[in-house]
């Protein structure tokens, strides 16, 4: 015998009390598939969530993040600071990247820069919090009649040295 | 696959206190550091506490210094998170989240994997 219940589609719900009519999904909440017993109850996204898709009677609320943080966890479920470029983000909140070191985005760790010289490569543009080196041509390309020239080491701070 | 279960958050009056519970699956648990991270309602994430694969290492944030208490059971694949005169100021989502290695600190935010979270709400 089939289930009457497999009747009621996405957004109703097979009601036990009224003889398993198909009725629909209370307000604030949903069922998304068909020959549902229950409706679910809608996410509300509240105080750093924002909503990015409203609930139906068939899907659920979608939330996002409020600017100034971005979303971690599968569905959005947690909410993360921005950092400013030129910052991490430390069990204590946002912290400038150490010497040596940069990040270019509102996420993620301060990364080192690039070694020019790992690549027999000079440093053209010195690295910055915010920006990587820029590595220019290798310095034996810069004069043409010598047959080995020692590469120079990355450009430094004076009074720093890399942490 | 890894997987963080918390459990034993709930409603407790100020003053009062709680342990919550974080069992873990899919890794070898004394190998990494955990922490525990909450979220209020209004705020973003915020690190609460973490320790060592050998729970010899502890940190605290200042906020919950000398009234939270860390610990872990390697043989049980738990951590846990005493929880003593708290205030409103508590009221949070708390995630138990694994590092990525074994050692830990108060500064490098080195989280890989996160559980679904357990709700304290501290009000009278």
């Known amino acids: 015998l089939q289930d009457p219940c497999s009747n009621c589609p996405a957004g109703t719900f097979c009601d036990n009390n009224r003889n398993q009519i198909c009725s629909p999904c209370p307000p604030n909440s949903f069922s998304s598939a068909g020959g549902q017993r229950t409706c679910d109850i809608c996410r509300q996204c509240k105080g750093v969530f924002r909503t990015r898709k409203e609930c139906s009677s068939t899907s659920n609320a979608e939330c996002d993040c409020t600017p100034g943080f971005h979303c971690l966890g599968a569905g959005c479920s947690m909410c993360e600071q921005d950092c400013k470029q030129g910052q991490e983000l430390t069990k204590k909140g946002c912290k400038d990247c150490c010497f040596g070191t940069f990040n270019d985005q509102k996420r993620g760790i301060c990364r080192p820069w690039t070694n020019c010289s790992l690549d027999g490569k000079s440093v053209l543009v010195n690295g910055t919090k915010e920006r990587d080196v820029v590595c220019g041509p290798s310095p034996a390309d810069l004069s043409p009649g010598a047959s080995s020239v020692t590469p120079p080491a990355p450009a430094r701070e004076p009074g720093h040295s890399p942490q | 696959e890894v997987q963080l279960l918390e459990s034993g958050g709930g409603l407790v009056q100020p003053g009062g206190s709680l342990r919550l519970s974080c069992t873990a699956s899919?890794?070898?648990?004394?190998?990494?550091?955990m922490s525990w991270v909450r979220q209020a309602p209004e705020k973003g994430l915020e690190w609460v506490s973490s320790i060592s694969g050998s729970g010899g290492s502890t940190f605290y944030a200042d906020s919950v210094k000398g009234r939270f208490t860390i610990s872990r059971d390697n043989s049980k694949n738990t951590l846990y998170l005493q929880m003593n005169r708290l205030t409103a100021e508590d009221t949070a989502v708390y995630y138990c989240a694994k590092e990525g290695s074994n050692g830990t600190d108060d500064y490098h935010y080195d989280i890989d994997v996160w559980g679904q979270g357990t709700t304290v709400t501290v009000s009278s």
């Open positions: 899919g890794f070898t648990f004394s190998n990494y550091a």
